[in-house]
Interface confidence: low
């Protein structure tokens, strides 16, 4: 639910014509923090798919216990299954770890639907296909959960990569990445390449397939094409950014830009869909419907409840529009745009009844907690979480799904005025982030 009163919205955004480009401040890209170039040991260290999350292999305890851990930029706890559960193949057994330390404190995390709760402790943690370091990190040992673990997802825990402000039970619990940076020489930066398959994967295919890469401490040039464009992190809690304009097939939605960020806009690898505030969602769906009007789809499709299927290999990608989100740039009055294809926002799903067909779910949905740029957005791009410089970078992913006519894009710069006014100032109520 939405909380608090709505702030008065500005009637318009002073945007210059899109043809007007700002000159680059320099021909050189500013030097990135951390190591650049090749991170061979970390490439292809993720598996999974957008509907069930992407996970990385981690080890916990002494001797090391191997677990698959969901990579989640929308939360800040490192939490692992620590008791038997019907959906878990394995779980963290604290009693078997000589380095486990009990913090004698509980943690409870309810979601709009579902919850998990557990006991806090610390232990030694490492990432086999990551930096060659071991850190002592806070761990929430999940002892009870409801609608949290996903049957068949193959992950047993969650790695919250956002900031301490949203850690549970409170911001005194240091998140894993903070511990990693503090205790080692790993630069304060990570990057994600999530690779959507473009077709449904059965269980054995998911286990065998490559899901992408989490590069810890740097940027790997082999994972993207073109340039990286950066948007400021507005506030260090979630990875909050500011969207300044939205276009469907090049047509501006023409909404007050505050609406796009009502009540925040975040980059969240732990969410499947592109989630949009109610008003924006309605306008976007109306525009997508109009653009794809050569075919009719049931209302349930647009609500994400019904599948739409085509005979194998005949999906009419060309009737669906591209979607562009303009993000605040690093330079005053400068923005850039990221453009996704229907191959990102139509999510392939298995439909047992019609296995000869290609079936899809509409992966844009309505939100009451702001815009969430989930996996369907991230699957188009290589995304750099440059915590050191408080910014997020986007470049076209080398693994994004496209066709011979269109490709995802990251382009700029564009002149956009008064971008600061696009940020929504959340009315100060404690519960504004309560039901994420």
């Amino acid at each position: 639910t939405q909380h608090g009163i709505r702030l008065p919205l500005r009637s318009g955004l002073g945007g210059a014509p899109l043809g007007l480009r700002l000159p680059r401040e320099t021909d050189e890209e500013p030097e990135e923090p951390g190591r650049r170039g090749s991170f061979v040991e970390m490439v292809d260290n993720l598996r999974g798919k957008s509907g069930q999350g992407y996970y990385v292999e981690m080890t916990v305890g002494s001797p090391p216990q191997t677990l698959n851990i969901l990579v989640d930029t929308g939360s800040s706890n490192f939490a692992v299954g620590a008791a038997p559960h019907p959906f878990l193949h394995r779980y963290y057994q604290r009693q078997l770890s000589s380095t486990y330390r009990d913090l004698r404190k509980g943690v409870y995390v309810p979601y709009t639907q579902g919850k998990w709760e557990g006991e806090l402790g610390t232990d030694l943690v490492s990432i086999p296909h990551g930096p060659n370091v071991t850190v002592r990190a806070n761990i929430a040992a999940i002892t009870e959960s409801d609608k949290f673990f996903i049957n068949g997802s193959n992950w047993e825990g969650i790695l919250g990569l956002a900031y301490a402000e949203i850690a549970r039970p409170d911001d005194s619990l240091e998140p894993f990445f903070d511990s990693l940076v503090k205790q080692t020489h790993v630069p304060n930066l990570f990057s994600l390449q999530l690779c959507g398959a473009g077709f449904p994967l059965n269980q054995s295919e998911v286990l065998a397939s490559v899901g992408g890469s989490m590069i810890i401490g740097g940027i790997d040039h082999s994972l993207y094409t073109g340039s990286l464009w950066y948007t400021p992190i507005r506030r260090e809690w979630y990875y909050e950014v500011i969207i300044v304009r939205v276009e469907i097939n090049g047509q501006d939605l023409k909404m007050d830009c505050k609406e796009y960020n009502y009540d925040k806009s975040i980059v969240d690898s732990g969410t499947t869909n592109l989630r949009l505030p109610k008003k924006v969602f309605e306008a976007a769906v109306k525009s997508i419907k109009a653009a794809s009007s050569t075919e009719k789809f049931p209302d349930g499709f647009w609500l994400g409840e019904q599948l739409v299927c085509w005979q194998a290999g005949t999906t009419p990608w060309n009737i669906f529009p591209v979607i562009s989100l303009y993000l605040m740039g690093e330079v005053t009055n400068q923005s850039f745009r990221i453009t996704i294809l229907p191959q990102q926002y139509l999510r392939p799903v298995e439909d047992v009844a019609t296995s000869q067909d290609d079936c899809y779910k509409f992966a844009i949905s309505q939100s009451s907690t702001g815009t969430v740029m989930g996996a369907v957005i991230m699957e188009g791009f290589y995304v750099v979480f440059d915590r050191a410089r408080k910014r997020i970078g986007f470049a076209v992913s080398a693994c994004h799904v496209h066709d011979e006519f269109r490709t995802a894009a990251v382009e700029g710069p564009f002149v956009t005025l008064d971008m600061e006014d696009c940020g929504y100032n959340i009315p100060q109520t404690d519960e504004s982030t309560l039901m994420t």
Epitope: T1, H3, G4, Y108, P110, T112, K115, E165, I166, R168, P169, D170, D171, N425, I426, P427, Q428, T429, D430, E431, S432, T433, L434, M435
Partner: antibody
């Protein structure tokens, strides 16, 4: 240790204003919301509003809108609650209590400030 | 506004008794419920948050349960120091609302 220390008791005439202070210590003042709750003699607890010490943003109960002002001074880790146009039924003990974002309870309370409104 | 209704408003019990206090919300509040204990002349003290999570330092004889609209605070074995007034409160939406309180007295 973590504590909230409130200003002393006040006696006010109807129509006057009162300003109660709440000094935080033992934790990062800007990391927690501050709420104000009052309790009339022999009655239950009544929520008045909250302030985000970081931004200064406030949220007031409808009942007190226009009469209450919550402020803070981060340099001295102190929150203030001012209630104007006092009436006799404003006689109560006023408490400040801290609440974390994403925490569910008011986990630390001030000792309370008794405000008596009498002509 | 979400109304919180507590029952009973008062009860008499003896040391060692199992005591149950209920709280009903006027609309579903999921698990967003807190319980507080208040002794005369003192500030309230947080016992339970999120319906069932025990606040640090609170004895394990206190427990909370429920979700949606109906919630329960249970004291498994009443101790002399537990005689006090207990309040429920919802932190889900503004205005924050408290129940009317339940006074637990010595029989």
């Amino acid at each position: 240790q973590v504590q909230l220390v409130q200003s002393g008791a006040e006696v006010k005439k109807p129509g006057a204003s009162v300003k109660v202070s709440c000094k935080a210590s033992g934790y990062t003042f800007t990391g927690y919301y501050m709420h104000w709750v009052r309790q009339a003699p022999g009655q239950g607890l009544e929520w008045m509003g909250s302030i985000n010490p970081n931004s200064g943003g406030t949220n007031y109960a409808q009942k007190f809108q226009g009469r209450v002002t919550m402020t803070r001074d981060t340099s001295i880790s102190t929150a203030y609650m001012e209630l104007s146009r006092l009436r006799s039924d404003d006689t109560a003990v006023y408490y400040c209590a801290r609440v974390r974002v994403r925490h569910y309870g008011m986990d630390v309370w001030g000792q309370g400030t008794t405000v008596t409104v009498s002509s | 506004d979400i109304q919180m209704t507590q029952s009973p408003s008062s009860l008499s019990a003896s040391v060692g008794d199992r005591v149950t206090i209920t709280c009903r919300a006027s609309q579903s509040i999921s698990s967003y419920l807190n319980w507080y204990q208040q002794k005369p002349g003192k500030a309230p003290k947080l016992l339970i948050y999120a319906a069932s999570s025990l606040q640090s330092g609170v004895p394990s004889r206190f427990s909370g349960s429920g979700s949606g609209t109906d919630f329960t605070l249970t004291i498994s074995s009443l101790q002399p120091e537990d005689f006090a007034t207990y309040y429920c409160q919802q932190p889900l939406s503004h205005p924050r609302t408290f129940g009317g309180g339940t006074k637990v007295e010595i029989k």
